[in-house]
């Protein structure tokens, strides 16, 4: 049904009439995300009309069907000037249970009124700017915390708490105010931490072999995606031994979803969401990934269970083979190991032993090959300069952050990034003095040294001289004209 | 007979084990000398890079040695101001208060009667009024079309602090000032056992026989160039844009016999000031056949590319290109703060529509 | 304020059995490392046993194979089950928490008053 003939049905006022188009606009349109440009002024007024009855209060019995229709029209860009008033977000607010008012909401709400209106919410906050801050200020945070926190007393069906959970990723995302305001007044990472257990349904029995059904998997990912919103900017700060305890068990979850799988396909999507978390966690409290029970089958390393970090090292190499989003897919990750291996030297050996292993191949350069040195080696030199410096800082942390062995393992051509950002251009060590790390010469290494180029990193032979067989006259003329084109440049 | 060995035989084997052994070492230590020359023009970031190593390598410059630098550092800030002063005439820009021009006159009489190493409290108040005026903040957002020191703003805007009496110059004040290089400043520096000997090479013609001695043998170049340089206008005395300039000599001495099988590590420096211009000024001003968008990823490949296709040896030669920002020595506790801001962006991307 | 409090011991006949428990109080149970240390007459402190907050578990040799840790963060109480006990497990033992949430094995933050475990024919 055209949007002008469901208006004009609208004008006329005939109660099941409107339904009954409503009803086959529904239909129609479910799966409309694009709109035709030329009904664009009969959406409009649609819209309007919508809004006019919304705002005024829409019948109990048809309200989901109403509801649904708002949704589909915001989806269009045009009419979310008509949807983003401070009078239809109260009432789109008031329908999905989340609005701060004084008279209470007739209990217990009915569920598909509460999803419709959350889905009308979701939209228009990810759509308009101005629908954000008027959530914003109506503070549907509030709400919305408040009914997560009752998740654990009370059954809402899944679809409810997805969609409460993706209005928070939104508002939290999309406004610094929101974020500050759950992360303190709201209390928002315990909160959510206790929302990620229950959801993760894992206390207190730690079984790393776990699948991830779909839809926990689905609601995980939004509680680590706000997570990650009101973390990032937060706990950079030195943080108290409450706070500390905290953080440390929501380390402890996070290494638990490290090692689980998630149902349907979404096992790499899952992992990445916890690993950014991860990364915004207080670097004291990094030591949870290396702090799993030594079990039957775990994967030991100085008394260490490397099980963990063996993951994230399996979820960088698959991270590598993307070509799409490079800084975001491999910064994080890399930066949890960097700051792993930073703190913990048996996490260090251990990374090491799996990254840089003892040199053998000097006959190709550091960035050529499949390894995952080859791999990292090529990212310095990336055009993105946080792609490289953190993949550079990853090798140069497993190096001990020595200057000499970096070169050994990279080439002094390819370190010259890292080493410049730092100032290490000339050598130097830093103030971070690590317990001195023996590196290993395999035989190879030993017998080709001599000939191996430091500024490439492989052996070449020594090239014949250039200027061989030239007079003292000539060369002095070959090299002032290289002076003459240097006095141009340094002009 | 088994295989046994004569005590005789054993020394022999031992002996000649003992003289390979030599050999490899007096090899290893003509081979693990790296010479690198450093290359770049005027303000390519070159000189910090060698600051940079007495900053962190050397601890650090002393208070005795940065109070040295307070007068090239007021220098420097004087310089800059008036290089905008008179691109305002140059430009045709008014000041936006008449005022202003009393207090040009007198920055021209007072900076002639500057003292080195000092700054009275009138000629600050000068510069501060000056630099605070609209007419003078239009003509410095118009740098391209002159000659100005990228340290201009860092300096002007910190007026307050360095005009202090009791000033001494920070690292990073030491960081940012502009002295012209000449000759040949040459940098020794060991890591374990690689010795390094860089030649930080200005323009001056001294003598030839040290030139020669630098030029032979040299195991890698470094190269740079400022990115920022793309969109500056000719000055009246030069031929070529002086990104182009770079081009050509980057082609001149990146195919050079001498240099046949020197790697080249191309520092593409003041990649921040490029990410800032970028979005102003298109890269066409300097590449005309560029048809990439202007952004920071496709117009830094773009100028990548046009050097590196200059190598005319590609599979003997390699170039190690890096993109810095040559005044971050912060060594900050190494967190992905950059990249947070990106994955919010992607996961909003990734919310559809329901 | 922290406080964590051990449930009666007793005495045991060798090759017996008992259980002890811990109640805790004035801290969120479930963010902390738990441990059970004991202290044999005239002897130091000997680590037994520890459990993540997840409930994954680690033993001392002397009691691996016949001591079992465990909590409920819903009743905020950790256990020890020990089985097979012999004269050498008489001890005070002692429920430990491990400082801000991290990983210990002797240098708890806060600790009970300590029951007494008697195993004696």
């Known amino acids: 049904m055209e949007p002008r003939a469901v208006a004009d049905a609208l004008e006329t006022g005939e109660e099941d009439a409107v339904t009954e188009a409503l009803r086959s606009f529904n239909r129609e349109h479910s799966q409309s995300f694009t709109f035709d440009d030329a009904q664009q002024e009969d959406r409009k007024r649609l819209a309007k009309l919508l809004v006019s009855v919304l705002e005024q209060g829409l019948s109990p019995k048809h309200r989901v069907t109403w509801l649904q229709t708002i949704r589909i029209l915001s989806r269009d860009r045009s009419c979310l000037d008509s949807f983003a008033s401070r009078q239809s977000l109260h009432a789109l607010a008031c329908y999905a249970d989340i609005a701060i008012s004084e008279e209470p909401i007739p209990q217990p709400p009915d569920m598909d009124v509460l999803l419709e209106s959350l889905k009308c919410l979701c939209n228009l906050v990810l759509s308009s700017p101005t629908a954000q801050m008027l959530a914003a200020e109506a503070r549907l945070v509030v709400r919305l915390a408040e009914r997560v926190g009752l998740y654990r007393k009370r059954s809402y069906p899944h679809e409810v708490q997805f969609f409460d959970l993706r209005l928070l990723f939104l508002l939290t995302a999309l406004r610094t105010d929101v974020r500050q305001q759950l992360f303190q007044e709201l209390h928002g990472v315990r909160l959510l931490t206790d929302a990620l257990e229950l959801t993760l349904g894992v206390a207190p029995k730690e079984n790393p072999l776990v699948i991830l059904p779909a839809q926990e998997t689905e609601r995980a990912m939004e509680i680590l995606k706000v997570l990650f919103n009101i973390t990032y900017d937060s706990v950079k700060r030195e943080v108290d031994e409450e706070d500390a305890a905290l953080y440390r068990y929501l380390g402890t979850l996070l290494r638990h979803c490290v090692m689980a799988d998630a149902a349907g396909d979404r096992t790499e999507e899952f992992h990445g969401h916890t690993v950014n978390l991860l990364g915004n966690l207080p670097l004291k409290c990094l030591d949870v990934l290396l702090a799993l029970e030594l079990h039957e089958g775990s994967l030991e390393f100085m008394g260490v269970n490397m099980d963990v970090i063996n993951a994230l090292l399996a979820f960088l190499e698959k991270r590598l083979h993307q070509t799409h989003r490079l800084k975001e897919c491999v910064a994080p990750v890399l930066s949890v190991l960097t700051e792993c291996a930073r703190m913990h030297r048996p996490a260090r050996k251990f990374l090491k032993a799996q990254v840089l292993p003892p040199l053998r191949d000097v006959r190709t350069r550091p960035e050529v090959g499949d390894l995952l040195r080859n791999k990292l080696v090529r990212l310095m030199t990336h055009l993105d300069t946080d792609v490289k410096r953190v993949a550079a800082e990853f090798l140069f942390v497993l190096c001990s952050e020595s200057v000499p062995r970096f070169i050994k393992y990279t080439g002094y051509g390819n370190a010259a990034g890292l080493l410049a950002a730092r100032g290490l251009m000339a050598g130097g060590r830093p103030e971070g003095q690590y317990s001195e790390d023996e590196d290993t010469d395999t035989e190879e290494y030993r017998e080709a040294k001599a000939s191996i180029n430091p500024v490439t990193g492989r052996v070449e032979e020594k090239p014949p001289n250039p200027m061989e067989g030239m007079t003292e006259e000539q060369k002095e003329h070959e090299a002032m004209k290289l002076v003459n084109m240097f006095d141009k440049l340094s002009r | 007979m088994g295989c046994t060995l004569s005590a005789e035989d054993k020394a022999a084997v031992e002996r000649s084990k003992m003289i390979d052994r030599n050999l490899r070492e007096d090899g290893e230590k003509a081979a693990r000398e790296v010479k690198l020359l450093l290359l770049g023009a005027g303000e390519s970031g070159k000189s910090t890079i060698v600051k940079q190593m007495k900053i962190i390598h050397e601890a650090g410059y002393s208070e005795e040695e940065c109070k040295q630098y307070k007068a090239v550092v007021y220098s420097n800030t004087i310089q800059s101001i008036i290089a905008i002063i008179r691109a305002m005439g140059r430009l045709k820009i008014d000041f936006g208060d008449a005022a202003r021009a009393d207090d040009a006159r007198q920055l021209f009489v007072l900076a002639g009667a500057a003292e080195e190493g000092f700054m009275t409290a009138e000629l600050a108040g000068v510069i501060k009024r000056l630099w605070k005026d609209s007419g003078v903040q239009a003509c410095f957002n118009r740098s391209r079309e002159y000659q100005l020191n990228d340290s201009a703003a860092y300096y002007l805007n910190d007026l307050d602090r360095i005009a202090q009496p009791n000033y001494i110059p920070t690292q990073q004040d030491v960081l940012r000032t502009r002295v012209k290089t000449t000759g040949i400043v040459e940098t020794h520096f060991t890591f374990k056992d690689l010795h390094f000997k860089m030649f930080d090479v200005g323009g001056q013609r001294s003598e030839r026989k040290k030139w020669i001695h630098c030029f032979e043998g040299v195991t890698a170049i470094i190269f740079c160039v400022a990115l920022s340089d793309y969109d500056l206008v000719l000055a009246e005395d030069e031929e070529m844009n002086r990104m182009h300039e770079s081009m050509k000599l980057f082609d001149s001495i990146c195919n050079n016999k001498w240099f046949t099988d020197t790697s080249i590590i191309l520092f593409l420096n003041k990649k921040d000031l490029f990410e800032e211009k970028i979005k102003k000024s298109p890269l066409t001003i300097c590449y005309p056949e560029y048809a990439g968008s202007n952004t920071y990823e496709e117009a830094a490949a773009y100028i990548q590319c046009q050097f590196e296709d200059l190598n005319k040896r590609k599979d003997t030669k390699e170039i190690y290109t890096h993109f810095t920002c040559a005044t971050d020595t912060k060594n900050v506790q190494f967190v992905f703060d950059a990249v947070t801001d990106v994955i919010i962006k992607n996961n909003l991307k990734d919310c559809g529509l329901f | 304020q922290v406080q964590l409090v051990e449930s009666e011991g007793g005495l045991v006949q060798p090759g017996g059995s008992l259980r002890l428990s811990c109640a805790a109080s004035?801290?969120?149970?479930?963010?902390?490392?738990m441990n059970w240390v004991r202290q044999a007459p005239g002897k130091g402190l000997e680590w037994v046993s520890r459990i993540n907050q997840l409930g994954g578990t680690s033993y001392g040799d002397s009691v691996k194979g016949r001591f079992t840790i465990s909590r409920d963060n819903a009743k905020n109480t950790l256990y020890l089950q020990m089985n097979s006990l012999v004269p050498e497990d008489t001890a005070v033992y002692y429920c430990?928490?491990?400082?801000?949430?991290?990983?210990?094995?002797?240098?708890?933050?806060?600790r009970g008053q300590g029951t007494q475990v008697t195993v004696s024919s």
């Open positions: 430990a928490r491990c400082p801000a949430g991290a990983a210990c094995k002797v240098e708890y933050d806060y």
């Open positions: 004035g801290f969120t149970f479930k963010y902390y490392y």
